[in-house]
Structures are given as C-alpha cells and as structure tokens.
C-alpha cells in the first residue's frame, strides 16, 4: 500500500516471547510523508486500550521508516499482555493491530525456555 | 511475484525425523507469516503450525506440539518444518504457505513436498 | 478448535450452471478488529491449493468475477456464477481468526 496516509506496520496477531528482568523495545513502526504523526502506546484490558502515560519512549529514524519505541526496562511479569500503538494524523485516529507480549517469569539463566516451548505454554490465550 | 520453492520428496523410516524447507522470493519475509499445512493422500488439509520470520515466534496446533519444529533463516529467506518420531500416518504432502502480515494482501503456496513414511 | 463443516461435500455440476458451497464454523470468525477471517481455497487435481477469496468476499488477484464469497459471523458461502471446466476440483473454506487454525473437510466439484 503506498499512500501518503499514515500507516502503522505491525503485523496482525504478532507475538513475541520475553523474559522478565531482560530490557526490551517494543516497536512501532510508522510509515508518513510530511509530518510525523503523534504515537502513543496502550495495553489491552479486555476490550479497552488503556494509554501508557508514564512510560519510556522514544523515536528511531531510519531512512524509508521511523519506529515509535516503548522501553521495558526491565521487563516486568505484569507486562503479559496485548498492546497497540496509535497515530494522530490530520484528526484522524489510525490504531494499529495489537501485539502479544508473553512473559516469563525466569527463576534461572538455566531455565531460560526456548521459543517453542514458550509457544507451548496452556496459559498462552489466542 | 512472490513464489515458494520447496525441497524434494523424503522417505524416512517410522522413528526417525523429516526436515522441509522452503524457500520464499519475491518478498521480505520480515513482512509476512509462514505456515506449513500437510494433506495425507486422498485426504483434506491440516494445519501444523506458523512463523513470524521477524522474531522467530512459532505457534502449533495442539496435535503437533513437541513434534513439531518451525524456524525461519532471516537471511536465506527460507522456513523450515521439522518433524521427529515420524510414524506412517504422518505419511502426506507437506506444505508451506506464506501470508502478507498487515493486510493479508496475499497467500501463496509452495508446490508441495511428499514425505514418505514405511519400514 | 474451531470446527468449519462445510455442504455438500460432493456437488455435481453442469458446465455453465452455478454452483454454491455452504461453509459453517463452530463460533464467530468476527475478529476484535472488526473484520472475519474467512477463506476460500481452490485445489485443482494434483496441484497446490491456491486462495480464491479472503475476508469473506475480497478476490485474489487473477481470480475472475465468476467467483464470489459472502457470509457473516459463522455462516459462509461460496458461489461459481457459471462453472466452467477449470474449475473442476476441490474447494476448502478455512478460518484465519483463531489459532490454530482450521479447515472444511473439502467440496469436491465435479462434472455431472
């Protein structure tokens, strides 16, 4: 899609599995012509998209894309959950899809779960 | 055009594991999802699994959990599907697809690798 | 899982007549982004399968007109305006809202 609309490249039902106590960027990629767009992020609650008002931030340019980033430092357990990134451009709301951060809770370097077995865990939800 | 090239036809004893590549062109994977999806002979269609080839994130169905395997190499632009302890009802034409993560604008099927499973 | 049943599952035809596929799933495919995850497969003998309709109604490219989706919620259909001879094969409506996902048992269109 090429268009001078806004466009927010996450890609539908993304997920990621991460460690809690590990840093993590969790990014936003925005496509725009003229003007950057306002960003924000929000995490899922049911159905609401609650705004992520006092957290990290920041902005990473590259040549054809910019990335609206939001920093876990460290990550924490209760970061598990869906989140979306949100662009104001021209009045208009543009919200992307939402993307699923998977925690976990490491006891030990050594039981660090691998990327399937994070797939595999029952309390994942779809 | 975006196209998938798989890798050829195995036969492989009842115990033993089967590897499938397939190699996508015409897109950056980054950009997509690979699944691959397997149909035993005269048989419908049954889906195993998914990656995000961005972050290496793998997601089964339940029925293959623990037997199946998914990577993708970034750099080759190729996804694999591995399978261990095969057995003769894993007997099937293994595919591999690839979607378009943001709009599901395409789907497009590799040609399709049998995979032979008998003592 | 979500089950996707579809009817009938063998439906002869007549070339140049229509010919309608009916495809249930088990729960809504009506995803948080308002949008429904349903596709439509073609598999042509002892080819690949190729996608001929997602999101319900959207045609792929180089799909022809004579092909339509329709359908909400759980209830879907597939309809050929007037069959033709490459059309002959089989037909599988498939969920892209849940994980995992998951298949009709196939339509196999043939001549009568």
């Known amino acids: 899609k090429e268009s001078c609309d806004v466009q927010l490249y996450i890609k539908r039902q993304s997920e990621h599995s991460i460690l809690a106590g590990d840093p993590f960027e969790l990014e936003c990629p925005v496509k725009y012509c003229a003007n950057r767009p306002h960003v924000t992020w929000c995490k899922l609650n049911g159905t609401t998209c609650v705004k992520l008002e006092d957290r990290q931030t920041s902005w990473k340019e590259e040549k054809n894309i910019s990335f609206f980033i939001l920093h876990f430092e460290p990550v924490l357990p209760n970061d598990n959950g869906s989140y979306r990134c949100s662009a104001n451009f021209q009045s208009n709301l543009i919200e992307s899809h939402s993307t699923t951060l998977y925690v976990t809770d490491v006891k030990s370097a050594s039981e660090r779960p691998s990327k399937d077995e994070m797939a595999s865990r029952p309390w994942l939800l779809y | 055009q975006v196209q998938l090239v798989q890798s050829g036809a195995e036969v492989k004893k009842p115990g033993s594991s089967v590897k499938v590549s397939c190699k996508a062109s015409g897109v950056n994977i980054k950009d997509t999802y690979m699944y691959w999806v397997r149909q035993a002979p005269g048989q419908g269609l049954e889906w195993i699994g998914r990656i995000d080839p961005a972050n290496g994130y793998a997601r089964y169905a339940q029925k293959f959990q623990g037997r199946a395997t998914i990577t993708a190499d970034e750099s080759t632009s190729t996804a694999y599907m591995e399978l261990s302890s095969l057995r003769s009802e894993d007997t099937a034409v293994y595919y591999c697809?690839?979607?378009?993560?943001?709009?599901?604008?395409?789907?497009?099927w590799g040609q399709g690798t049998l995979v032979t499973v008998s003592s | 899982d979500v089950v996707m049943t579809q009817s009938p599952l063998s439906l002869p035809v007549t070339l140049g007549q229509p010919a309608s596929i009916s495809c249930r799933s088990s729960?809504?495919?009506?995803?948080?982004?308002?949008?429904?995850?349903l596709n439509w497969l073609q598999q042509r003998p002892g080819q690949s399968p190729r996608r001929l309709i997602y999101?319900?109604?959207k045609r792929d490219s180089g799909v022809p007109d004579r092909f339509s989706g329709s359908g909400s919620g759980t209830d879907f259909t597939l309809k050929i305006s007037r069959v033709e001879a490459e059309d002959l094969g089989v037909y599988y409506c498939?969920?892209?809202?849940?994980?995992?996902?998951?298949f009709g048992q196939g339509t196999k269109l043939e001549i009568k």
């Open positions: 999101l319900v109604s």
């Open positions: 729960q809504s495919l009506l995803d948080s982004d308002g949008k429904t995850y």
């Open positions: 498939w969920q892209g809202t849940l994980f995992p996902r998951t």
């Open positions: 697809a690839v979607y378009d993560g943001y709009y599901e604008s395409f789907d497009v």
